[in-house]
Amino acid sequence: QPCPYPMAPPNGHVSPVQAKYILKDSFSIFCETGYELLQGHLPLKSFTAVCQKDGSWDRPMPACSIVDCGPPDDLPSGRVEYITGPGVTTYKAVIQYSCEETFYTMKVNDGKYVCEADGFWTSSKGEKSLPVCEPVCGLSARTTGGRIYGGQKAKPGDFPWQVLILGGTTAAGALLYDNWVLTAAHAVYEQKHDASALDIRMGTLKRLSPHYTQAWSEAVFIHEGYTHDAGFDNDIALIKLNNKVVINSNITPICLPRKEAESFMRTDDIGTASGWGLTQRGFLARNLMYVDIPIVDHQKCTAAYEKPPYPRGSVTANMLCAGLESGGKDSCRGDAGGALVFLDSETERWFVGGIVSWGSMNCGEAGQYGVYTKVINYIPWIENIISDF
């Protein structure tokens, strides 16, 4: 005997359509785009019913239910807004992701996503992954460098990329993105196999203050060309933090130099070094200090360090020098690993041009200069480490 004629559920259709369905005949249900098969409350990948010899179908008719993409994922350092209606997550619903203003900017796409028939939130470019809120780099309360003056106390927000590194000795670093610290290889060399021993602090001006943002190291990457106790060539390292830090006016990453950065780092251009290193009084500074110093001609610097006690070739092409011929303005022990920063007048953002590396035994000595790792030479190395890890 024939089976009852199958009536398609709303938003679905029967295939094949026959005048009658007898023993072993079958039909399938296909839902319209944006609808999915449900048996009871359970989703089905496909549905086919077969006519049995007693004249009944072997399975009950399913329903075609509108696709629901479900609540969208939270966007780190951002938020999501329901455009179609509050909490509407069904087929063709629209949501808009945005990043926290001022300190984050959206990468990948415009943040607009639509609930598509496959049940995925999908961007206008067809991406199913979330957009990315990337920290804005190089923001500072300081508007310009320009004048040379030394031993100045930093104010809140002046050097929000400044990182204090404790672990054996006092050193410094600069925040990159929201989970990396750029520093000098010699400053963290002893901890390269014990990254967790590094006590990393940021968001504070006072070295001894109990009020700071704590970060811990997951891994230390020392440049493979650096040889400890054999000069300071390739004196650069990256610390990967085990968690992303929250960006705000007191904690902001420094920018890496663009290709055009060298035009802001010519001889006599002013850079700014900051740190808690030794001051003229011979003690570590309690408050974060900074000094604006000019870049020194490379040949002049090389010559200054060619006489004893310095070995020939101390100053390499991977270094840049800064300071005053008359002395008095310099970085010193305890500042190592900190950033020598420059203002990019086109983007109005600060970028790291140098890393505090080495200098004369007596800081601020006349005719001697502070020597800094030339960061622009290491952009491929930095980018490779960060993308691989």
Epitope: Q39, G40, H41, L42, P43, K45, S46, D68, G70, G119
Partner: antibody, heavy 118, light 107 residues
């Protein structure tokens, strides 16, 4: 925030009946396409589905245990109750209640260890 | 009740890709679901309806399902991914779980 919490005896004697209660919050037992499942896991073994109930009161049971299981819900108390008769030491397991959404068991309770021993 | 068979164990080095299979008769005609369970914890849904990730599950988890085999893939495996993994499917209106796979991330 969706939460499910199992409660019931930690020790039952062989042949006794086990009654487990699942108290839910953060979603409704009476609306939508949501359901609640009971799943168990004997120590060191795999997960074993037992039964489920949906908002429409549609129920389903593990074939091999169907005669021993009963699932019900009390919407006013936000509770789902599972009873299992004629308990045996082999029924010793951690019993979980969990929410079903879009066919996936997306929120689980912390589980309750039930030991069957005389 | 139908059987879903998984390999008992899978070992993977950090950063490498781990693939866990789940085999069952015409499994590709049904939706597959995957759960992660760490010792002493309740299971966590990591993939639903073959290839969809619930909110909060990292992008390194992905799924596929065709023929008689569903596969869970963990790309760039991390130490925290070490756990037991179970597949699950619905047969009519009853749920069936796989035998489980222990994923070990080599030190």
């Amino acid at each position: 925030q969706v939460t499910l919490k199992e409660s019931g005896p930690v020790l039952v004697k062989p042949t006794e009946t086990l009654t487990l209660t699942c108290t839910v919050s953060g979603f409704s037992l009476s609306r939508g396409k949501m359901g609640v499942s009971w799943i168990r896991q004997p120590p060191g073994k795999a997960l074993e589905w037992l039964a489920h109930i949906f908002s429409s009161d549609e129920k389903s049971y593990r074939t091999s245990l169907k005669s021993r299981l009963t699932i019900s819900k009390d919407t006013s108390k936000n509770q789902v109750v599972l009873t299992m008769t004629n308990m045996d030491p082999v029924d010793t397991a951690t019993y979980y209640c969990a929410r079903i959404r879009a066919g996936g068991i997306d929120y689980w309770g912390q589980g309750t260890l039930v030991t069957v021993s005389s | 009740q139908p059987v879903l068979t998984q390999p008992p164990s899978v070992s993977v080095s950090p950063g490498q890709t781990a693939s866990i299979t789940c085999s069952g008769d015409k499994l590709g005609d049904k939706f597959a679901y995957w759960y992660q369970q760490k010792p002493g914890h309740s299971p966590v849904l990591v993939i639903y309806q073959d290839n969809k990730r619930p909110s909060g599950i990292p992008g390194r988890f992905s799924g596929s399902n065709s023929g008689n085999t569903a596969t869970l893939t963990i790309s760039g495996t991390q130490a925290m991914d070490e756990a037991d993994y179970y597949c699950q499917a619905w047969d009519s209106s009853t749920a069936v779980f796989g035998t489980g796979t222990k994923v070990t991330v080599l030190a």
